[in-house]
Interface confidence: low
């Protein structure tokens, strides 16, 4: 009779993470008598996966009933596959011996590849806001994928970025891999509405990459420009002075009026107007009773934006041409700055 052969018909098997792998194995003869064992890997360090005779293998089930006398099908199923299960599996026939069974013949092996999708890329930006013309770094991370081959691209508003560095870890063989990339982005004043996108392509995604995004509105600070102007006289003894705060982001802004260095009024930007580029404009105005002043008045609009050091713009108000009204003790009238807006 022809000598027993152990046949593993599948050179390779591809399984999605979380699923069940079927590893096929048949013997060509019932002789010699003895059990089958499955191993991952070859040589002295091989790992026992299933032993027909003894042991507890909760993830392994046999395809057919190995207790049947004439059974020659030794295929197994391994449940809940993870990338850690990847490797070459050998079906090995043992000959009954005393005291121990003796290895008789091995199958050619079946390589189990596990495909695991990368996690959704997570993009994170700098901890603190930065102003236009500054370069900021964004990081992108994705984990748990297998095989190792992966591609990562960065985009800003659909335009591909080139200034980035990417690492896939670990460098050597592993059950699954992670990717980490850092991109440098130069901010412009128009970036309030901009997006940075990290795109990850992997064989398991069938050509449709995963994307992670970060909004530059979380990263950018556009400082305001200030303009203080004197409006035509409302009444004979009143002058209207406006402070236009333009093109700022984010909205958090506090404005203080100073008359000759003394605080006249402080207010917080509330009813702002939004520009097309996402920045804001705001206007505050102050009614100055010139009859209360003997000399020229230095009016200062001081703005503290998003917790940054204050910026200011001053305007010299000439009062010498105005007749003095006796008995007036109000230097500035507290007016709501939000009722009117020139934008």
């Amino acid at each position: 009779e022809e000598e027993l052969q152990v046949i593993q018909p599948d050179k390779s098997v591809l399984v999605a993470a979380g699923e069940t792998a079927t590893l096929r194995c048949t013997a060509t003869s019932l002789i010699p008598v003895g059990p089958i064992q499955w191993f991952r890997g070859a040589g002295p360090g091989r790992e026992l996966i299933y032993n027909q005779k003894e042991g507890h293998f909760p993830r392994v089930t046999t395809v057919s009933d190995l207790t049947k006398r004439n059974n020659m099908d030794f295929s197994i199923r391994i449940g809940n596959i993870t990338p850690a299960d990847a490797g070459t599996y050998y079906c090995v026939k043992f000959r009954k011996g005393s005291p121990d069974d003796v290895e008789f013949k091995s199958g050619a092996g079946t390589e189990l590849s596990v495909r695991a999708k990368p996690s959704a890329p997570v993009v994170s930006g700098p901890a603190a806001r930065a102003t236009p013309q500054h370069t900021v770094s964004f990081t992108c991370e994705s984990h748990g994928f297998s095989p190792r081959d992966i591609t990562l691209k960065w985009f800003k508003n659909g335009n591909e970025l080139s200034d980035f560095q990417t690492n896939v870890d670990p460098v050597g063989e592993s059950v699954s891999y992670s990717i980490h990339s850092t991109a440098k982005v130069v901010l412009t004043r128009e970036d309030v509405h901009s997006q940075v996108i990290c795109e990850v392509a992997h064989v398991t995604l069938q050509g449709d990459p995963l994307r992670g995004t970060a909004n530059l509105s979380e990263t950018i600070r556009v400082p305001p420009t200030l303009e203080v102007t004197q409006q035509p006289v409302r009444a004979e003894n009143q002058v209207n002075v406006t402070c236009q705060v333009r093109k700022f982001y984010p909205q958090r802004l506090q404005l203080t009026w100073l008359e000759n260095g003394n605080v006249s009024r402080t207010e917080t930007a509330s009813t702002v107007t939004e520009n097309k580029d996402g920045t804001y404009n705001w206007m505050s105005w102050l009614l100055v009773n010139v009859s209360a002043h003997r000399d020229d008045v230095k009016l200062t609009c001081q703005v503290e934006h998003d917790g940054q050091p204050a910026v200011s713009k001053s305007h010299d108000l000439k009062v010498s041409a105005h007749p003095k009204e006796q008995g007036s003790n109000t230097a500035a009238e507290n007016t709501g700055s939000n009722e009117r807006n020139i934008y």
């Epitope: 591809l14 399984v15 699923e19 079927t22 495909r115 992966i150 591609t151 392509a201 050509g207």
Partner: antibody, heavy 119, light 112 residues
Framework: QVQLQQPGAELVRPGSSVKLSCKAS????????MHWVKQRPIQGLEWIGN????????HYNQKFKDKATLTVDKSSSTAYMQLSSLTSEDSAVYYC????????????WGQGTSVTVSS | DVLMTQTPLSLSVSLGDQASISCRSS???????????LEWYLQKPGQSPKLLIY???NRFSGVPDRFSGSGSGTDFTLKISRVEAEDLGVYYC?????????FGGGTKLEIK
């Protein structure tokens, strides 16, 4: 051996829907993508979309986005494609094909289901 | 969508001769991670299509070595070095790099 079994033919009324099946055997169903392809006489082959049975991730050809819905039943290793609001333009042979994700190739094909839309 | 244009539309070849089919894509079909997913399929009369070549030049298991694929970027070729009677049918190229994936219009190979 790998097999994809599809019913031979379906006769359906205009305006109705039909659910085509594709029963897979001989391999681990959840390990490979399943593609669907349309073939009309003289008109060659059109890719409709595909589905990953392990997590029901789908990709569609936009042309078929409102026409076809791809689903799977892992317990029976069966892929389905539902075609809705049928017109004579939908009369065609529809193939399911296994997609091997490492190189995207459709390595095994079903025999196709011939759908005839007629009143 | 990527348009795949095959030439010629039909081809009549004597047994034992070489046949060559061209496929041109309307844009590069190099995938974002470097591979070119260009495939060739043969559909014999009354049968479903069968995979011949994947990733431009790799023969699928069981495909005779008289079939070979070549090309890059947007221009691809399928060659049959010695045509046999069983090779007749319609040959399709297919790109799997950009969704929606698209087939060429097909080339009918006839035996003289």
């Amino acid at each position: 051996q790998v097999q994809l079994q599809q019913p031979g033919a379906e006769l359906v009324r205009p305006g109705s829907s039909v659910k085509l099946s594709c029963k897979a055997s001989g391999y681990t169903f959840t390990s490979y993508w399943m593609h669907w392809v349309k073939q009309r006489p003289i008109q060659g082959l059109e890719w409709i979309g595909n589905i990953d049975p392990s997590d029901s991730d789908t990709h569609y050809n936009q042309k078929f986005k409102d026409k076809a819905t791809l689903t799977v039943d892992k317990s029976s290793s069966t892929a389905y494609m539902q075609l809705s609001s049928l017109t004579s333009e939908d009369s065609a042979v529809y193939y399911c094909a296994r997609g091997y994700s490492k190189y995207y190739a459709m390595d095994y094909w079903g025999q196709g289901t011939s759908v005839t839309v007629s009143s | 969508d990527v348009l795949m244009t095959q030439t010629p539309l039909s081809l009549s070849v004597s047994l034992g001769d070489q046949a060559s089919i061209s496929c041109r894509s309307s844009q590069s079909i190099v995938h974002s991670y470097g591979n070119t997913y260009l495939e060739w399929y043969l559909q014999k009369p009354g049968q479903s299509p069968k995979l011949l070549i994947y990733k431009v030049s790799n023969r699928f298991s069981g495909v005779p070595d008289r079939f070979s694929g070549s090309g890059s970027g947007t221009d691809f070729t399928l060659k049959i070095s010695r045509v046999e009677a069983e090779d007749l049918g319609v040959y399709y190229c297919f790109q799997g790099s950009h969704v929606p994936y698209t087939f060429g219009g097909g080339t009918k190979l006839e035996i003289k």
